[in-house]
Interface confidence: medium
């Protein structure tokens, strides 16, 4: 599902982002997970794919090309195109699930034919086919008859699933393992900095023991913790200092309107 | 040290079956972070990716749609190996046809372990 | 498809210089989807590079792989005797997975 890039360099155009981050270079940050993500590339006006570190970076990355989109190109939810009610569903949303062979842990969703809806599975990052959409607007848009869903979505939660650092298995063919449930982090409202500044702070997957620092947006400080090397998420960095630089502006303290990403 | 064993005849007739195995020593066919594959190479095509099957607590494929209505892959657990099966062949069959394996590895992935090849003309 | 086009088709060189193999995907692939093969006559391919830039087991470290998105490098610092061969670059990223034409180093 990735969205075809150009064969060349354009000039940088006069079209203005809609946010100054959407100006910044994509930045894979120090770690070494291997997260597809999206950033909006200024020379070419299109968002486009790169591979995320795990931790740091900037705030030009996006989980879904559908949000890079929304947040960094001028009009683009007034003119993406809906599906006609009536259209016909293409051939590949009859495809049976794919996580495909790679080893991420990337939350998709497809068109289940069963149920007729479209549901969440777990794609590991490549390989996998067609019936796989990066957000479940876009899966229904594409799959799900508009006519037929008005019922809720049939959600597979993320819980069924264990990851042993290698590839998704279903939680039945693991030894008692479950993945713990994160906690609930403070609401949007009370700040305006990198959503990834609210994460809780997460050790990862492997087995070494790297002393990072997260910002606990309760406190407004930012505290130490050990990360095991891989995984996590990105609220995770080297310094005190880069924490606070990272998260510290984000917090209000007086009420305003409005929302930034 | 992983090795693939290829087996199966090198001479088919037109509109026959071409049939192929891969014998797997040092890993598992059942393997939940490999991929087990078949490419075939000739000078007109070059190497061209035919499919694979791997398993995530369930059986996948995946099978390139020039072949796709006349492929099969079929794991064999009890004896650690897979098959190619590919129907109606015509003379544009003939090529060297090789297994691998595909590795996801911390990288990304790539075919690190291939089997001997195994020239098949399709000839009457 | 996502279509690999390798350049040049043949490269001549002598042992000890620098062979720059590139391959151009039609499509971005980013960068942990790319792997180089080295093929010789009567054998099959050998994995060199995957996810661009990292090298198989045992391959030299002479052997460097570059690039993300749409053009990657296959880089031999210093041409051994046992290095002419045809290389292969092949995408991992989508199905179909698909190889280039190759690229032949040959001897000068």
């Known amino acids: 599902l990735s969205e075809e890039a150009d064969d060349t360099d354009s000039e940088l155009g006069s079209m203005k982002p809609l946010h100054t981050f959407c100006a910044m270079k994509a930045d894979d940050g120090p770690c070494k997970a291997m997260i597809r993500s999206y950033f909006f590339n200024m020379y070419t006006h299109q968002c486009e794919e790169f591979i995320y570190g795990g931790c740091e970076g900037n705030e030009n990355r996006f989980d879904t090309l559908e949000e890079c989109k929304k947040t960094c190109i001028p009009g683009y939810e007034k003119t993406a195109v809906k599906a006609a009610s009536g259209a016909e569903r293409p051939d590949f949303c009859f495809l049976e699930e794919d996580p495909g062979l790679c080893r991420g842990y990337m939350k998709r969703y497809l068109y289940n034919n069963q149920t007729k809806q479209c549901e969440r599975f777990v794609y590991g990052g490549c390989l996998g086919n067609r019936n796989n959409f990066e957000t479940l607007d876009e899966c229904k848009k594409i799959c799900e008859n508009p006519v037929h869903s008005p019922s809720p979505v049939n959600e597979v939660q993320m819980s069924d699933y264990v990851t042993d650092g290698n590839t998704v298995t279903d939680r039945s063919t693991v030894n008692n393992i479950v993945v713990p449930q994160s906690p609930k982090v403070p609401r949007r409202r009370d700040y305006r900095g990198r959503p990834w500044c609210l994460q809780p702070a997460d050790s990862g997957l492997c087995k070494a023991s790297e002393r990072r620092f997260y910002y606990n947006s309760a406190t407004g400080k930012c505290h130490r913790f050990n990360y095991t090397g891989c995984g996590g998420n990105n609220n995770n960095f080297t310094t005190r200092r880069r924490c606070l630089r990272s998260c510290k502006t984000g917090l209000i303290k007086n009420k305003s309107k409005g929302v930034v990403k | 040290q992983v090795q693939l064993q290829q087996s199966g005849p090198g001479l088919v007739k037109p509109s026959q079956t071409l049939s192929l195995t891969c014998a797997i020593s040092g890993d598992s066919v059942s393997s939940n972070s490999a991929a087990w594959g078949w490419i075939r190479q000739s000078p007109g095509r070059g190497l061209e990716w035919l499919g694979m099957i791997y398993y995530r607590s369930k059986w996948y494929n995946s099978y390139a749609v020039s072949v796709k209505s006349r492929i099969t892959i079929n794991p064999d657990t009890s004896k650690n190996q897979f098959s190619l099966q590919l129907n109606s062949v015509t003379p544009e069959d003939t090529a060297v046809y090789y297994c691998?394996?595909?590795?996801?590895?911390?990288?990304?992935?790539?075919?690190?372990?291939w089997g001997q090849g195994t020239l098949v003309t399709v000839s009457s | 498809d996502i279509v690999l086009t390798q350049s040049p088709a043949t490269l001549s060189l002598s042992p000890g210089e620098r062979a720059t193999l590139s391959c151009r995907a039609s499509?971005?692939?980013?960068?942990?989807?790319l792997a180089w093969y080295q093929q010789k006559p009567g054998q099959a391919p050998r994995l060199l590079i995957y996810?661009?830039?990292t090298r198989a087991t045992g391959v030299p470290a002479r052997f460097n792989g570059s690039g993300s998105g749409t053009d990657f490098t296959l880089t031999i610092s210093s041409l051994e005797p046992e290095d002419f061969a045809v290389y292969y670059c092949?995408?991992?990223?989508?199905?179909?997975?698909?190889f280039g034409q190759g690229t032949k180093v040959e001897i000068k």
């Open positions: 092949q995408q991992l990223n989508s199905i179909p997975v698909t």
């Open positions: 499509q971005n692939i980013g960068s942990n989807y």
């Open positions: 691998a394996r595909t590795m996801s590895k911390y990288g990304g992935p790539g075919m690190d372990v």
């Open positions: 996810g661009a830039s």
